[in-house]
Amino acid sequence: LNTTVLQGMAGQSLRVSCTYDALKHWGRRKAWCRQLGEEGPCQRVVSTHGVWLLAFLKKRNGSTVIADDTLAGTVTITLKNLQAGDAGLYQCQSLRGREAEVLQKVLVEVLEDPLDDQDAGDLWVPEESSSFEGAQVEHSTSRNQETSFPPTS
């Protein structure tokens, strides 16, 4: 499973959309978690509504919001007021009982707001986004950038 790389500016919002096979994942809740290390468990940040039919309702934990469009097969996570400490590796998951299937791995990069940094030239964003093989890199500097990931096979 490839890791998707998303960039957001500190203080702004980053929206992540993970798509999945709506039939295969029928009836399953979705979750967003932080991967603190390869060996350790993925630490749950937020999950969709406990009643699957109400999964379209937004669920919030702190500054992270999740909502699931179960018909379209798209779960959307919004990281509001992005902080430096939010940078890291995350997963979109589909929950089945106590088991969790990884829908997408997401590496979140938080960039300094140039307006907060008088020497903004010191923050370097490469022109070539594909400098890391196997990683999709998307620059998100708008307040509501939405990125859709293709369904995983």
Epitope: T3, V5, Q7, R34, Q35, L36, G37, Q43, Q83, A84, G85, A87, G88, L89, K105, L107, E109, L111, E112, L123, W124, V125, P126, E128, S129, S131, F132, E133, G134, A135, V137
Partner: antibody, heavy 115, light 107 residues
Framework: QVQLQESGPGLVKPSETLSLTCTVS????????WSWIRQPAGKGLEWIGL???????IYNPSVKRRVTMSVDTSKNQFSLKLTSVTAADTAVYYC?????????WGQGTLVTVSS | EIVLTQSPATLSLSPGERATLSCRAS??????LAWYQQRPGQAPRLLIS???NRATGIPARFSGSESGTDFTLTISSLEPEDFAVYYC?????????FGQGTKVEIK
């Protein structure tokens, strides 16, 4: 098991450029972030900066006008360059994987700034 | 930048005793705090992440807690290999910063 190994000159002259490379083995460099941290003898730890998967960098303001970090994915390496060094830059330099926290470290390399 | 102040600077204890190390942040770090152990001549090792989560392979005698901007590392019963320097580190805001360290030495 991920392993990190720092390499580079152990002695650098004042006003010259310190250059170090960190080689990552046992895993791909491309799915994580990577930091440099230094420790003067008998003192505490100072974070120098990090390089993201995309190649974007965040530097500590204390050194940001003198520091450059880069990555070479084909060699599974990332590097540090620190210009205009002085005796105050003498320290053990560590590279580390920055996955929310520094979970893997190199063993460190001592760099002495002296003429 | 966020300043982390560790206390005491040195803690003199005997094996089997309980060690309590403190780290105070100059502002909120939202639980984004870690503890590291550094033995002489070695690189630091991650013990605790997110203020209270033990890292993989770390013995249960190590535990972390928080109360606002005050963080505590507790070693319930010191083993000979636990005598080392301990650092706290925040990654709530750039630049990532470390405390100045607490040395746990044999009494």
């Amino acid at each position: 098991q991920v392993q990190l190994q720092e390499s580079g000159p152990g002695l650098v002259k004042p006003s010259e450029t310190l250059s170090l490379t960190c080689t990552v083995s046992g895993g791909s460099i491309s799915s994580y972030y990577w930091s440099w941290i230094r420790q003067p003898a008998g003192k505490g730890l100072e974070w120098i900066g990090l390089i993201y998967t995309s190649g974007s960098t965040i530097y500590n303001p204390s050194v940001k006008r003198r520091v450059t970090m880069s990555v070479d994915t084909s060699k599974n390496q990332f590097s540090l360059k620190l210009t205009s060094v002085t005796a105050a830059d003498t320290a053990v330099y560590y590279c580390a994987r920055d996955l929310f926290y520094f979970d893997y470290w190199g063993q460190g390399t001592l760099v002495t700034v002296s003429s | 930048e966020i300043v982390l102040t560790q206390s005491p600077a040195t803690l003199s204890l005997s094996p089997g005793e309980r060690a309590t190390l403190s780290c105070r942040a100059s502002q909120s770090v939202s639980s984004y705090l870690a503890w590291y152990q550094q033995r002489p001549g070695q690189a630091p090792r991650l013990l605790i992440s997110d203020a209270s989560n033990r890292a993989t392979g770390i013995p249960a005698r190590f535990s972390g807690s928080e109360s606002g901007t005050d963080f505590t590392l507790t070693i319930s019963s010191l083993e000979p290999e636990d005598f080392a320097v301990y650092y706290c580190q925040q990654r709530s805001n750039w630049p990532w910063t470390f405390g100045q360290g607490t040395k746990v030495e044999i009494k």
